[in-house]
Amino acid sequence: AIVFIKQPSSQDALQGRRALLRCEVEAPGPVHVYWLLDGAPVQDTERRFAQGSSLSFAAVDRLQDSGTFQCVARDDVTGEEARSANASFNIKWIEAGPVVLKHPASEAEIQPQTQVTLRCHIDGHPRPTYQWFRDGTPLSDGQSNHTVSSKERNLTLRPAGPEHSGLYSCCAHSAFGQACSSQNFTLSIADESFARVVLAPQDVVVARYEEAMFHCQFSAQPPPSLQWLFEDETPITNRSRPPHLRRATVFANGSLLLTQVRPRNAGIYRCIGQGQRGPPIILEATLHLAEIEDMPLFEPRVFTAGSEERVTCLPPKGLPEPSVWWEHAGVRLPTHGRVYQKGHELVLANIAESDAGVYTCHAANLAGQRRQDVNITVATVPSWLKKPQDSQLEEGKPGYLDCLTQATPKPTVVWYRNQMLISEDSRFEVFKNGTLRINSVEVYDGTWYRCMSSTPAGSIEAQARVQVLEKLKFTPPPQPQQCMEFDKEATVPCSATGREKPTIKWERADGSSLPEWVTDNAGTLHFARVTRDDAGNYTCIASNGPQGQIRAHVQLTVAVFITFKVEPERTTVYQGHTALLQCEAQGDPKPLIQWKGKDRILDPTKLGPRMHIFQNGSLVIHDVAPEDSGRYTCIAGNSCNIKHTEAPLYVVDKPVPEESEGPGSPPPYKMIQTHHHHHH
């Protein structure tokens, strides 16, 4: 059976705030959970949505979320449906509304000494408490001539007299919060001696050195007085103008004219009307100096044909708010069509190539005009001028593959070799026009090449196969000097490649034929048993039909390979004594001997007084020290081969003779000369 682990419960909620109705279910089968509001399924919206099995409210709405919520779980194996307990919200809210005239029925019926009732249309749950204001001053219940009915949300003035005239507003507050009237009521009960506003001055914005006019008129019986003040309460009259308002004129009808306005004239102007009775009426208006800042620069834009794009023109800061319009080719853009202006945006729908060009955003106000250009490029898909062709490229020479395309903006070209991107290096170079240069063509360059030309609008690609025309060449070229061991078998290889498989043959440089014990087998010269007469110059000739022939000259030397007659032995020497490491080698040509001591070659010209290498190859070290210990290698070499052999040298302290030892007692050390190390 289905079990509710958590059930939704009724709760208080605040209008516009988050809330969560919890529901957690356990069932043996696959369970599907959904929510009902007054028996109808709840559809997910951004404001109200299922969160797991629970129902989440991003912002509670008193109209849409009033009612009974229920969580329903369905087991889709058995079909069983279980419904949770009902849950609802007690939504707390407050909503502003206007102050309206309840009695009499119209303003025209308001006369002095009649009863006037105003109603505050602020509503909420729980019911809020109300506070009334006249001209911003709170009215407390029980004051003379008015009563406040909180339940009715009414303010009653009885009887209403001129002293009740003013702007009436109300505020209400509850546990949810507070709100004030969205529209206030002006009660005007005439007392002829009170000043009344006929014309109030308005805020003005003017350009520098232009003129500004403020109108101000009051009426009363007898006529009221009118006075203008600027910012610092300085009175402005035609007789006494303050220094910074030399160009001010007050007309008989109360209007104030300022000519050649400068920054110091900007500020608040007050017009004060005073009747024979009643309070003065102070009206304010501000004079602003028009200004306009510079416009930010546009980045050039690249668009693709067929798409819809927008470019927003941020108007420069200015007063008054600058108006913005777009122009193209000197013509103002319309507010509809395919290319049009919407708000501050330039809109290009279904972009065509012909839309490319310079578009100008203009901004203007009283202070002047600013403009900024944006360069629009319409990207086109590249088209072919020349595709890469299947090519035969010669080995060792530069090779070129074309990939010539045109588009706007200039397309970028990349090359692939065997599906791998070619990065430019010493061998490959991609020219500005897209052509690929292979600096020195190699055999393994024979493969597939693909070039791709792209712009933001799209890309095209083509591939070509490269066939490498091989040079006729030796692979590898034979060593020009080679040695053969006397009285042994020897082979001298020679191989070559070309466009066609070359034939290879050997001949002696003097043109004489090869002796019968020397065979030429597919380019390998084979000596069954090397004699002294086999030494000399030989030529390997490789040839094929299309490429002719090439020759490689080889000088063969017959040598007796090196052997050691005497090799150095493992030697132990007392410190300060002399060490002798013998080495003698034989071979033809006669080998030269070099020594390596402790991993560095001992240069006979830089040995110093303690070391010496004899003509026969032996090494002598006088006055040996511990640091002379180590491995010594004798290296014998001639033009044909090289051999080495090594032995360790140990330098030890001479023992101090003990008194107990008789004159005939043997030394504790023997000069050891035992086995040696031998390497080929």
Partner: antibody, heavy 113, light 112 residues
Framework: QVQLVQSGAEVKRPGASVKVSCKTS????????MHWVRQAPGKGLEWIGV????????SYNQKFKGRVTMTRDTSTSTVYMELSSLTSEDTAIYYC??????WGQGTLVTVSS | DIVITQTELSLPVTPGERASISCRSS???????????LNWFLQKPGQSPQLLIY???TRASGVSDRFSGSGSGTDFTLKISRVEAEDVGVYYC?????????FGQGTKLEIK
């Protein structure tokens, strides 16, 4: 025991509507939801929708939206499925299923001109 | 919509042998509660479908223990340990994660 008995076979003209019934017994009708599934000849199973028998709420497969109407009569413990604007593609066996554990015997609906 | 794919449309088996039927989903069928919402049905010739397995591996009431279900979030298998002649029919898998509930095309088990 749980029993779902469906109405008999129907033959309809293209453009017409068909209403298939599924009478239930052996359990408390309003405690269980009912699914409808159809199977075209030689084809697989296709879910049409589900009705909650308590409130009568429905969830339909978008494919049938606007053509299918599922209703229930709690007094007779019967669920109905009506399909309108019939075409030959709607020729199939229509099954009602309580959950997916208990199935009706199926109703063959043939749409032919 | 979630797409349920049964690759083998037909599966010939020798009686007594083991059979495996696979099913794949285009989206994970594992819900936040950790359960995998997949059903297996058998429709014998001329009959209504019958539920074999629910929640991927739970046998429905009265279903033989020769049937077992397993899988991951998107790949599922129904195994029959020793096939009997009465097991022939079309096997369907079905997802219950989101509307519309969708079925696989079905795999027909036949006796060799």
């Amino acid at each position: 025991q749980v029993q779902l008995v469906q109405s008999g076979a129907e033959v309809k003209r293209p453009g017409a509507s068909v209403k298939v019934s599924c009478k239930t017994s052996g359990y408390t009708f309003t405690d269980y939801a009912m699914h409808w599934v159809r199977q075209a000849p030689g084809k697989g199973l296709e879910w049409i929708g589900v009705i909650s028998t308590y409130y009568g709420n429905v969830s339909y497969n978008q494919k049938f939206k606007g053509r299918v109407t599922m209703t229930r009569d709690t007094s007779t413990s019967t669920v109905y499925m009506e399909l309108s604007s019939l075409t030959s593609e709607d020729t199939a066996i229509y099954y009602c299923a309580r959950g997916f554990a208990y199935w009706g015997q199926g109703t063959l609906v043939t749409v032919s001109s | 919509d979630i797409v349920i794919t049964q690759t083998e449309l037909s599966l010939p088996v020798t009686p007594g042998e083991r059979a495996s039927i696979s099913c794949r989903s285009s989206k994970s069928l594992q819900k936040k509660d950790g359960k995998t919402y997949l059903n297996w049905f058998l429709q014998k010739p001329g009959q209504s479908p019958q539920l074999l397995i629910y929640l991927m591996s739970t046998r429905a009431s009265g279903v033989s223990d020769r049937f077992s279900g397993s899988g991951s979030g998107t790949d599922f298998t129904l195994k029959i340990s020793r096939v009997e002649a009465e097991d022939v029919g079309v096997y369907y898998c079905q997802q219950l994660v989101e509307y519309p509930f969708t079925f696989g095309q079905g795999t027909k088990l036949e006796i060799k």
